[in-house]
């Protein structure tokens, strides 16, 4: 997280820290007491594109709450993970839910609307480009999708598109994604924050929902927008996968 | 009831028989285990128009179920009883509800629609113009209101109205009333049936509702329509009165 | 008049212990029921538990007891709707 | 971890008899509850009564017990929503 605030109170008990092969920090989001969402890209970090979920599983280390190590039983990649940058992690044991460790809900309603603010917590790189040692969070507005597409791809018209990412890496942008950021204080997500939730507070229900999962965490206040996978598009697959496994 | 059928099974456990001063039989309808609805006209039978509820109370005898005598504590007349022909009777003790003695529900929904069939039970006069000694009932369709008004008042236009009741007595007809009858078999309500419910079966809820209370029971298959007070217009007053008393 | 059987006698301590569930516990209660042709009218759900003062209380109604109110419009033998 | 107090010990027969109500009776039950941060997932309402075979049964779920599932999206210390 570039800028933002320290999570002193444990306000993001769904936030997990995942250490990938070769020690890179990434994010994951607890969505039940035995399952987490993260990005497919996170899972493939330092693996070849042909790696299987079985190959990936033993290379990951996962922490929830206050540095509580949890063991991973399996990884399930989204069947269309090159388009929907998502994977699921199943733990060997259910975690005990406490005030420090609690899943976030997956939404049935579509909370995404330009200007709406969400909270993104993360263990990713800070303004010094170091991985943070204390959980941070930032408050980011949902962006206008067309502006985001133009920012990264020059145009919304397919034949006029070309790759214009200010950070040299292109996000996956499609109907399953939305964009958020930047704040006027130049606060943003950064490397290692991917897999974290775009958390929205439904005030009617007094419940926090993961409206999205951060996929493109390379903006780092250089590019204007982080890109998130829409959680509403995941719910059916998530529920089926959890039920099957 | 003129024509109709005998209630052999006890299908109208809300039906009460009220004997007024000088032994006239009338109807009343159990709407809770301590309260009944009847018409104001029934209560005033053989009393002067200036009689008070306190004067009327001791002159009434009331039976529920299979001739079970119940004692009356008080009578409450509708505040506008010359327009809304209704009164409430409170019993000294709650009756024990059994398969023979059970209140009918008052509706929140408006069940009245032309052509809809309701059931009216009663202890009133039969085709021989004698009071029946066994409870009878008849199935009657809700009538078109304008036809009913024309039948009794010659016109629906106020300035063209004149009193044309085929039975020489005029019903109270207004926005608080509806009409029902006659069947093709010349079945009808008659003297003494007033105070009985126009009972409609809500098949969705499998519950019987008093959609109306028979006010004008003088049709006797000579005039075409009985006239009923709409129960939806009574509910608030009934609930307030029961709560206050 | 059928008044229902109490599932557990207050003088009977031979009651089998209910099974435990993960992350849960059991609470012992009484539920008020109504005889035939009556239904429960309660501020809460008609279920009462013993508080520390050994009084039966409902979470919503407190010590206030429910009432059994007469059912309406449910004749045991509805009319045969024929002509 | 707070697991709740059992309101009535199974070995304790000093339980005060609940008050009677007109036209009603009482039924004795156990209700499954969940510890903090969990909620009951049950086919029925989580309330079980003893049947004639002295088994704890729920009207909907039968002998199948409920589960305590993790609550989601209810942090004890939500973020201060200010900037």
């Amino acid at each position: 997280i570039i800028g933002g605030s320290m999570d002193a109170k444990g306000s993001f008990p769904w936030q997990a820290k995942m250490i990938s092969r070769h020690g890179l920090t990434t994010g994951a989001t607890l969505i039940s007491d035995q399952w987490l969402l993260t990005t497919a890209k996170n899972l493939f970090l330092n693996h070849s594109e042909t790696a299987s979920a079985k190959d990936i599983t033993p290379t990951l280390t996962l922490y929830v709450g206050k540095n509580q190590l949890v063991e991973i039983e399996k990884v399930v990649l989204h069947p269309n993970h090159s388009v929907v940058d998502i994977g699921l992690i199943k733990l060997k044991q259910r975690v005990l839910v406490t005030e420090r460790v609690m899943p976030i809900c997956l939404p049935s309603k579509d909370y995404i609307a330009p200007g709406r603010v969400g909270y993104v917590s993360g263990w990713g790189r800070n303004a010094n480009f170091r991985f943070t040692d204390r959980l941070k969070y930032v408050m980011l507005p949902v962006a206008d999708q067309d502006k985001c597409v133009v920012h990264y791809e020059n145009s919304t018209v397919p034949e006029k598109k070309n790759l214009t990412s200010p950070v040299g890496v292109q996000p996956i942008l499609n109907e399953h994604t939305f964009c958020a950021g930047l704040t006027k204080y130049q606060e943003d997500t950064c490397y290692g924050d991917a897999g974290s939730a775009f958390a929205i507070h439904d005030m009617e229900e007094d419940t926090w929902y993961a409206a999205g999962i951060l996929s493109f965490d390379k903006s780092c206040a250089v590019a204007e927008y982080g890109v998130y996978v829409r959680a509403t598009d995941l719910k059916d697959w998530v529920q089926e996968t959890m039920a099957k496994n | 009831i003129i024509g109709g059928s005998m209630d052999a099974k006890g299908s109208f456990p809300w039906q009460a028989k009220m004997i007024s001063r000088h032994g006239l039989t009338t109807g009343a309808t159990l709407i809770s285990d301590q309260w009944l609805l009847t018409t104001a006209k029934n209560l005033f039978l053989n009393h002067s128009e200036t009689a008070s509820a306190k004067d009327i109370t001791p002159t009434l005898t009331l039976y529920v179920g299979k001739n079970q005598l119940v004692e009356i504590e008080k009578v409450v007349l509708h505040p506008n009883h010359s327009v809304v022909d209704i009164g409430l009777i409170k019993l000294k003790q709650r009756v024990l509800v059994t398969e023979r003695v059970m209140p009918i529900c008052l509706p929140s929904k408006d069940y009245i629609a032309p052509g809809r069939v309701g059931y009216v039970s009663g202890w009133g006069r039969n085709a021989n113009f004698r009071f029946t000694d066994r409870l009878k009932y008849v199935m009657l369709p809700v009538a078109d209101q304008d036809k009913c008004v024309v039948h009794y008042e010659n016109s629906t236009v106020p300035e063209k109205k004149n009193l044309t009741s085929p039975v020489g007595v005029q019903p109270i007809l207004n926005e608080h009333t509806f009409c029902a009858g006659l069947t093709k078999y010349q079945e009808d309500t008659c003297y003494g049936d007033a105070g009985s419910a126009f009972a409609i079966h809500d098949m969705e809820e499998d519950t019987w509702y008093a959609a109306g209370i028979l006010s004008f029971d003088k049709s006797c298959a000579v005039a075409e329509y009985g006239v009923y007070v709409r129960a939806t217009d009574l509910k608030d007053w009934v609930q307030e009165t029961m709560a206050k008393n | 008049v059928e008044l229902g059987n109490d599932a557990m006698d207050f003088e009977d301590d031979s009651c089998p212990k209910p099974p435990e569930i993960a992350n849960g516990y059991v609470e012992h209660l009484v539920r008020y029921r109504c005889r035939q042709f009556y239904r429960l009218r309660a501020e809460g759900d008609g279920v009462y538990t013993l508080n520390d003062e050994k009084q039966w209380v409902n979470t919503v109604a407190g010590e206030k007891l429910p009432e059994c109110e007469a059912v309406c419009g449910k004749p045991k033998h509805p009319v045969d709707q024929v002509q | 971890v707070e697991l709740g107090n059992d309101a009535m010990d199974f070995e304790d027969d000093s339980c005060p008899k609940p008050p009677e109500i007109a036209n009603g009776y009482v039924e004795h039950l156990v209700r499954y509850r969940c510890r903090q941060f969990y909620r009951l997932r049950a086919e029925g309402d989580g309330v079980y009564t003893l049947n004639d075979e002295k088994q704890w049964v729920n009207t909907v779920a039968g002998e199948k017990l409920p589960e305590c599932e993790a609550v989601c999206g209810k942090p004890k210390h939500p973020v201060d929503q200010v900037q």
């Epitope: - | 929904k109 069940y111 629609a113 809809r116 098949m203 969705e204 | 045969d80 709707q81 024929v82 002509q83 | -």
Partner: antibody, heavy 121, light 107 residues
Framework: EVQLLESGGGLVQPGGSLKLSCVAS????????MSWVRQAPGKGLEWVST????????FYADSVRGRFTISRDNSNNMLFLQIDSLRAEDTAVYYC??????????????WGQGALVTVSS | DIQMTQSPSSLSASVGDRVAITCRAS??????LAWYQQKPGKVPKLLIY???ILQSGVPSRFSGSGSGTDFTLTISSLQPEDVATYYC?????????FGGGTKVEIK
């Protein structure tokens, strides 16, 4: 005049899904039970599903249970039928129908014009 | 579930004839039965409900009778405009099954 207007019909492949809508006007929609009835080409009427007025009770014919889902939106006077796992035998005109009286399940006094659903590969 | 069986499945009669269509329920449904008329290419039209009550606007040559399990729709004097398929439907509680239909034609 009471009106019922269906939409959402069309050609679908076996195994596919479709959502039919019925918009109602000129009556107090929430007070009436509403149903879907279908008619296969050249065949008779078949009751499909009913949604109660009060609460949220839903009923289905055995032939569609588990595949069809009826729902209603009283605030917008709309009735829906979500049709999943479509089969060739689901090909029919689907009618939206209103119970005649408050508290009644059936005896439909108003019908929509029908929406044709064709299941074919 | 209660089955509704209509007979005959089709009939042909002359103008002015008295025509009767029967509908049998596999279990008693009291008088909770409706009759519909459907002309080719048109939506069904309610004729009779509660077994014998004529829907407003329906000609009086149509009548219904019966209760329990056996019901009859009668057209006292068949008219050319009565050419249609007629259906019964149980209306007591779901499932709200229809009969198979009776096609009425003019000789």
């Amino acid at each position: 005049e009471v009106q019922l207007l269906e939409s959402g019909g069309g050609l679908v492949q076996p195994g596919g899904s479709l959502k039919l809508s019925c918009v109602a006007s000129e009556f107090t929609f929430s007070n009436y039970a509403m149903s879907w009835v279908r008619q296969a080409p050249g065949k008779g009427l078949e009751w499909v599903s009913t949604f109660s007025s009060g609460g949220s009770r839903t009923f289905y014919a055995d032939s569609v249970r588990g595949r069809f889902t009826i729902s209603r939106d009283n605030s917008n006077n709309m009735l829906f039928l979500q049709i999943d796992s479509l089969r060739a035998e689901d090909t029919a005109v689907y009618y939206c129908a209103k119970a005649q009286f408050v508290g009644h399940w059936a005896q439909y006094n108003y019908w929509g014009q029908g929406a044709l659903v064709t299941v074919s590969s | 579930d209660i089955q509704m069986t209509q007979s005959p499945s089709s009939l042909s009669a002359s103008v002015g004839d008295r025509v009767a269509i029967t509908c049998r329920a596999s279990q008693g449904i009291r008088n909770y039965l409706a009759w519909y008329q459907q002309k080719p290419g048109k939506v069904p039209k309610l004729l009779i409900y509660d077994a014998f009550i004529l829907q407003s606007g329906v000609p009086s040559r149509f009548s219904g009778s019966g209760s329990g399990t056996d019901f009859t729709l009668t057209i006292s004097s068949l008219q050319p405009e009565d050419v249609a398929t007629y259906y019964c439907q149980k209306s007591d509680s779901p499932p709200l099954t229809f009969g198979g239909g009776t096609k009425v034609e003019i000789k």
